[in-house]
């Protein structure tokens, strides 16, 4: 029950996280015009990964896409790549984790297969979250660097008289959405990995097996049960049996086609 809850919660948290990463990637407000200590202008500039926008006080908003690929800064391209990789990995992870959910039965899929799929999706979520966090952090670092550079430029001019107001940019809402979403995806991935451990069948003979010996009808019980039977250490009439007899749902998990995603 705890495993199912952990897996389910991990899935939901990752789903929210990936939705957030997609939202952050699409948002226009990665960087916004810094209004602090600036002359009050009637336009508000903000930029995203794909386009830059200007909102005028009169109510008009104009957005222009970055139609060039080669002319864009390498850092921006890197951030785009990280976010897209994060989304792709997250989407594949979600797809895998849906089939891995314990509460969903698909054919005669074994628990070992589900465990492997849960682990795979968990790793994908972790990498997806890290990609998003890395992408947002790289962009934030770029902003901080540019901010201080433009601040220095603001106060250097001919005779100290500033003729052009340098537009400085600060952190936009998308950065915070990205950080939170990346964190959630990461947490979701960790939860999936934890759930995987609980799903994986262990190599212990916990099931009582009935073995009919010739001549006598003796019920053999595996020794693994002795601690919980109430018979103490009285094992005189018991024989630890480790033969090939197994119950139906304790089939040895050999590598199968379901194990590899």
């Amino acid at each position: 029950m705890a495993v199912t809850a952990c897996q389910g919660l991990g899935f939901v948290v990752s789903l929210i996280g990936i939705a957030g990463i997609i939202a952050a990637t699409c948002m226009d407000q990665w960087s916004t015009q810094d209004l602090y200590n600036n002359p009050v202008t009637a336009v508000f500039n903000y930029q995203g990964l794909w386009r830059s926008c200007v909102r005028e006080s009169s109510g008009f908003t104009e957005c222009r896409g970055y139609f060039t690929l080669l002319g864009l800064p390498a850092m921006l391209q890197a951030v785009r790549a990280l976010m897209i990789v994060g989304i792709v990995l997250g989407a594949i992870g979600l797809l895998v984790s849906i089939f891995a959910l314990k509460c969903i039965r698909i054919g005669s899929m074994e628990d070992s297969a589900k465990a492997n799929m849960t682990l795979t999706s968990g790793i994908m979520f972790i990498v997806s979250g890290l990609c998003a966090i890395a992408g947002v952090s790289v962009f934030a670092n770029m902003l901080v660097t540019n901010f201080w550079m433009s601040t220095a430029n603001m106060y250097t001019g001919m005779g100290g008289m500033v003729q052009t107001v340098q537009t400085r940019y600060t952190f936009g809402a998308a950065l915070f959405v990205g950080w939170v979403a990346g964190g959630l995806t990461l947490i979701g991935g960790v939860m999936m990995c934890i759930a995987c451990r609980g799903l994986a069948p262990e190599e212990t003979n916990y099931k009582a097996v009935s073995y009919h010996a010739s001549g006598h009808s003796v019920a053999y019980k595996p020794g693994g049960f002795k601690a919980s039977t109430g018979f103490g250490s009285n094992t005189k009439n018991k024989k630890i049996y480790d033969g090939g007899a197994r119950t139906e749902d304790e089939v040895q998990s050999y590598p199968s086609k379901h194990d590899y995603v």
Epitope: V43, Q47, S52, S58, V162
Partner: antibody
């Protein structure tokens, strides 16, 4: 079509409060801003202030302490209030709709306000 | 506040003549975000409210004849009338639409010789 019409008292006594209403049609005040401009007789244009779609306002720094611009979206009305008027406030008062580039693309005909005792 | 300086204060021209008037702002009106200059030109005829001619320094308002051309960037701007017509006789104002409070130039009066 877009229309703006100013309605004012015509005559205001010195030190009184001047109140002008701008009634708009053909556009919504929740989408576009309205700006106020005045023109003393035989002189140039002076920007007074503006109220934008979101309700935020900006004022002429020299008149800020005396000016209040407000609006009623449901009535499609914008009002300008100027306290402690003097003869120097005698002018034609215009309201205008904000357009591209924060420019004023549609103007009212203006209302002449004379400050005199 | 931004100071808008217009020159000349008045000019007398013959019909069909090309005319140029200038406007200078105390700070750059260029917005780096969209590379547009927030300078507007208005025309005011006697007894009428001002009429929008040009916004973003060079974009003609719809319905404005193409003989009116706005140019310039940063702090220096120009309004050109390629061939003056009788109906162009008016006062022309430039306005800063970038920094609050918005400010007007003192105007250029266009008269017939």
């Amino acid at each position: 079509q877009v229309q703006l019409k100013e309605s004012g008292p015509g005559l205001v006594a010195p030190s009184e409060t001047l109140s002008i209403t701008c009634t708009v049609s053909g556009f919504s005040l929740t989408t576009y801003g309205v700006q106020w401009v005045r023109q003393p007789p035989g002189k140039g244009l002076e920007w007074l202030g503006a109220i934008w779609a979101g309700g935020n306002t900006n004022y002429n720094s020299a008149l800020m302490s005396r000016l209040t611009i407000s609006k009623d979206n449901s009535k499609s009305q914008v009002s300008l209030k100027m306290s402690s008027v003097t003869a120097a406030d005698t002018a034609i008062y215009y309201c205008a709709k904000g357009g591209y580039g924060n420019a004023m693309d549609y103007w009212g005909q203006g209302t002449l306000v004379t400050v005199s005792s | 506040d931004i100071v808008m300086t217009q020159s000349p204060s008045s000019l007398a021209v013959s019909l069909g003549e090309r005319v140029t008037m200038n406007c200078k702002s105390s700070q750059s009106l260029l917005n780096s975000g969209n590379q547009k200059n927030y300078l507007t030109w208005y025309q005011q005829k006697p007894g009428q409210p001002p009429k929008l001619l040009i916004y973003w320094a060079s974009t003609r308002e719809s319905g404005v004849p193409d003989r009116f051309t706005g140019s310039g960037s940063g702090t220096d701007f120009t309004l050109t009338i390629s061939s003056v017509q009788a109906e162009d006789l008016a006062v022309y104002y430039c306005q800063n639409d970038y920094f609050f409070p918005f400010t007007f130039g003192s105007g250029t009066k266009l008269e017939i010789k």
